[in-house]
Interface confidence: low
């Protein structure tokens, strides 16, 4: 990895384990300050392969609440608004980091935690595996 | 929010501002454990609306990289391959957390952030506005 | 009409250094990703670097990495390239080219528009 | 050594239909769409397909182009006397993380 030059106003660790175990500061800094028009709002609906959003939550988690899409068809809406089944309508999945409050209910206390959560939906062609 | 019941074995915190900082284990524990068939591996190339993946790296940021989707077209590919004006392509995008070193350059104290990443694409019927 | 000029190439000797400039008219320059593409006499084209609208990113090619410098002001619509410790092997047509989309593309669109080169040779 | 490898030359005659293959992995052309350029001799390339099987203005439709796995090709149909130069194709490589052109194919018409 990249070498961090250490900053002599840091805060001291004396944990045993360090750097295993930070202190992070849950005030959180929001980066996106232009609104983007690009914003997944309604692309669900519009989407030729659209999806219905479920709502993942988790007391114990942070964030507790996670949006999770499920493509609404195996395959694909065409112009007509009929389904195309000569395509597939799949899920892009990506890994998120999540905070799991460790040991259980503790406010103070958490473990990073790496979750795969479906975002949205894409059409694509299928594989087609011809026999020989 | 909800309520957590205290354990009486959590770690104690003495920070003034707490519950803003809390103590966070960087040994991830990865919940996807069985691999996933439609992990969306080759899906960005196969999808009629296409994306390329952008190394976005900053050593500052844990986790240090992150992959960006870019659409490779305006519109949308078709079963011949050509590209459908009359569709677009759309980034879906996703508010991920990341932890960023704060103060800078600290390997033990981190801010929670929140980016917006694009995940990958997806093919929508776009919205006509039409002059009256 | 769009437009790409490159110049500063010249004559040098191996170890020394170059900046080779080029600028750019008829399109927002600041909208689009640049590169750097030369050509060694009687050879193929060899890609040497490219750099995002921004200036944010770069990538090398890894014969030049540590050696070659890709940066631009938007200001000046112009893109350049600083060249340290060369070695005969730089000898070549320097190319700049255009990537074929706005915003924060560096191929899916081609290189759409090319300056019509500059000669660098790199001999003692 | 490129990352992609084309034939050294193609010939046909005018009219005829020349195809130029390019092969790559799955860190280039098998994860990205393939650019084709045109360098006729004493010029600067000139770009002649992008994205998949997109032309520029002006690029005549006698030029077209597939791709599939890890390998890409350009057809020219209708061979023109004006049409002789050489050709290359381009992607990016993941692994390099960079642009990669491949060896080029100098292409000459008979007669």
């Known amino acids: 990895g990249i070498a961090i030059p250490r900053n002599s106003g840091c805060p001291n660790s004396e944990d045993k384990n360090f750097p295993r175990t930070v202190m992070v500061n849950l005030n959180i800094h929001n980066r996106n300050t232009s609104t983007n028009p690009k914003r997944s709002s309604d692309y669900y609906n519009r989407s030729t392969s659209p999806w219905n959003l479920h709502r993942n939550e988790d007391p114990e988690r942070y964030p507790s609440v996670i949006w999770e899409a499920k493509c609404r068809h195996l395959g694909c809406v065409k112009a007509d608004g009929n389904v195309d089944y000569h395509m597939n309508s799949v899920p892009i999945q990506q890994e998120i980091l999540v905070l799991r409050r460790e040991p259980r209910h503790c406010p103070n206390s958490f473990r990073l935690e790496k979750i795969l959560v479906s975002v949205g939906c894409t059409c694509v062609t299928p594989i087609v595996h011809h026999v020989a | 929010g909800i309520a957590i019941p205290r354990n009486s074995g959590c770690p104690n915190s003495e920070d003034k501002n707490f519950p803003r900082t809390v103590m966070v284990n960087l040994n991830i524990h990865n919940r996807n454990t069985s691999t996933n068939p439609k992990r969306s591996s080759d899906y960005y190339n196969r999808s009629t609306s296409p994306w390329n993946l952008h190394r976005n790296e900053d050593p500052e940021r844990y986790p240090s990289v992150i992959w960006e989707a870019k659409c490779r077209h305006l519109g949308c590919v078709k079963a011949d391959g050509n590209v459908d004006y009359h569709m677009n392509s759309v980034p879906i995008q996703q508010e991920i957390l990341v932890l960023r070193r704060e103060p800078r350059h600290c390997p033990n104290s981190f801010r929670l952030e929140k980016i917006l990443v694009s995940v990958g694409c997806t093919c929508v019927t776009p919205i006509v506005h039409h002059v009256a | 009409e769009v437009q790409l000029l490159e110049s500063g190439g010249g004559v040098v000797q191996p170890g020394r250094s170059l900046r080779l400039s080029c600028a750019a008219s008829?399109?927002?320059?600041?909208?689009?990703?640049m590169h750097w593409v030369r050509q060694a006499p009687g050879k193929g084209l060899e890609w040497v670097a490219v750099i995002s609208y921004d200036g944010s990113n770069k990538y090398y090619a890894d014969s030049v990495k540590g050696r070659f410098t890709i940066s631009r002001d938007n200001s000046k619509n112009t893109l350049y390239l600083e060249m340290n410790s060369l070695r005969p092997e730089d000898t070549a047509v320097y190319y700049c080219?255009?990537?074929?989309?706005?915003?924060?593309?560096?191929?899916?669109?081609?290189?759409?528009?090319w300056g019509q080169g500059t000669t660098v040779t790199v001999s003692s | 050594q490129s990352g992609l490898t084309q034939p050294p030359s193609a010939s046909g005659t005018p009219g005829q239909t020349v195809s130029i293959s390019c092969s790559g992995s799955n860190s280039n052309i098998g994860s990205h769409s393939v650019n084709w350029y045109q360098q006729v001799p004493g010029a600067a390339p000139k770009l002649l397909m992008y994205?998949?099987?997109q032309r520029p203005s002006g690029v005549p439709d006698r030029f077209s182009v597939s791709q599939s796995g890890t390998s890409a090709s350009l057809a020219i149909s209708g061979l023109q006397s004006e049409d002789e130069a050489d050709y290359y194709c381009a992607t990016w490589d993941d692994s390099l993380g960079g642009y990669v052109f491949g060896s080029g194919t100098k292409v000459t018409v008979l007669g």
């Open positions: 008829g399109f927002i320059f600041s909208n689009y990703g």
């Open positions: 994205g998949i099987g």
């Open positions: 080219a255009k990537v074929g989309a706005s915003g924060d593309y560096y191929y899916s669109y081609g290189l759409d528009v």
